[in-house]
């Protein structure tokens, strides 16, 4: 699996999950989240050659097409597969509120 | 929706489904499919700016991050959303066989 266990400990050039820390204030301009100040969101990056963690029948065909037509702009793309939630604290008036923001952290990637 | 109805009739620069015809023999090197000779597979292409058909909470965050950090390599990617099957005919010996290959045709795209 192209997950954090494999990708963070290798020098993989193909589609893999990469480290990315997002500071809510600096990177998003968000002041409304009290805690945490930022989080390890991660992101997916890298080419998707033939048979590399391909998502569907279509992505197999497209990877094969791309292999035979390397100049073509049609190619599978490396995108999130498994996502995890992030618990946050924000204020409503003076009252702190805890909420889970779903699908916020990338744990693994796929070629789609 | 970023589907064939909208995308094929517009000059949309952002993420949209684009026309792509794949000739099985010329593009994939396949002789084993008897019918059809090729098909309109289509593909997804175009940038994914903030709020453009974003798939998850994470892709919204990443698009916003990208807006604030335009040089960053972390950005959502335009990938297939709705896929349709393709019926094919091939031969096993002298016997024709009809099969539906699932998820072969892109009907719409999303930013993931």
């Amino acid at each position: 699996a192209l997950d954090t266990n494999y990708c963070f400990s290798s020098t993989e050039k193909n589609c893999c999950v990469r480290q990315l820390y997002i500071d809510f204030r600096k990177d998003l301009g968000w002041k409304w989240i009290h805690e945490p100040k930022g989080y390890h969101a991660n992101f997916c990056l890298g080419p998707c050659p033939y048979i590399w963690s391909l998502d569907t029948q279509y992505s197999k065909v497209l990877a094969l097409y791309n292999q035979h037509n390397p100049g073509a702009s049609a190619a599978p793309c490396c995108v999130p597969q498994a996502l995890e939630p992030l618990p946050i604290v924000y204020y409503v008036g003076r009252k702190p509120k805890v909420e889970q923001l779903s699908n916020m952290i990338v744990r693994s990637c796929k070629c789609s | 929706a970023l589907d064939t109805n909208y995308c094929f009739s517009s000059t949309e620069k952002n993420c949209c489904v684009r026309q792509l015809y794949i000739d099985f023999r010329k593009d994939l090197g396949w002789k084993w499919i008897h019918e059809p000779k090729g098909y309109h597979a289509n593909f997804c292409l175009g940038p994914c700016p903030y709020i453009w058909s974003l798939d998850t909470q994470y892709s919204k965050v990443l698009a916003l991050y990208n807006q604030h950090n335009p040089g960053a390599s972390a950005a959502p990617c335009c990938v297939p959303q709705a896929l349709e099957p393709l019926p094919i005919v091939y031969y096993v010996g002298r016997k024709p066989k009809v099969e539906q290959l699932s998820n072969m045709i892109v009907r719409s795209c999303k930013c993931s």
Epitope: Q57, L64 | R25, L28, G29, W30, W32, V92, E99, L101
Partner: nanobody, 120 residues
Framework: QLQLVESGGGLVQPGGSLRLSCTAS???????????MAWFRQTPGKQRELVAL??????NYADSVKGRFTISRDNAKNTVYLQMNMLQPEDTAVYVC????????????WGQGTQVTVSS
Amino acid sequence: QLQLVESGGGLVQPGGSLRLSCTASGSTFEIYPIYAMAWFRQTPGKQRELVALTTDVKTNYADSVKGRFTISRDNAKNTVYLQMNMLQPEDTAVYVCNVGVVRGGLQNYWGQGTQVTVSS
């Protein structure tokens, strides 16, 4: 039972040659069409890298092996070959074959791999 058996690996000196073969056995390979056959290689701590790929009438090679390696197939024997010439130490790896079969969709099967070591 589906099986891919590779052979032909071994120890060879730089500049030498080897011919790998991968034979697909099992009823699936006789009944269903093969849509692609490929050779990949794997070095310790790295994922598999595509070396060569063949479909019915097209072949494709990694830049690092172009002009030195040749992929071919014998449909009657359900076998794919990899002729490797002018081998270099950086070609040292486990070579694994992959066969794509049309069986309720595009299915892929992996072999166990054969070790190729290029050293003087």
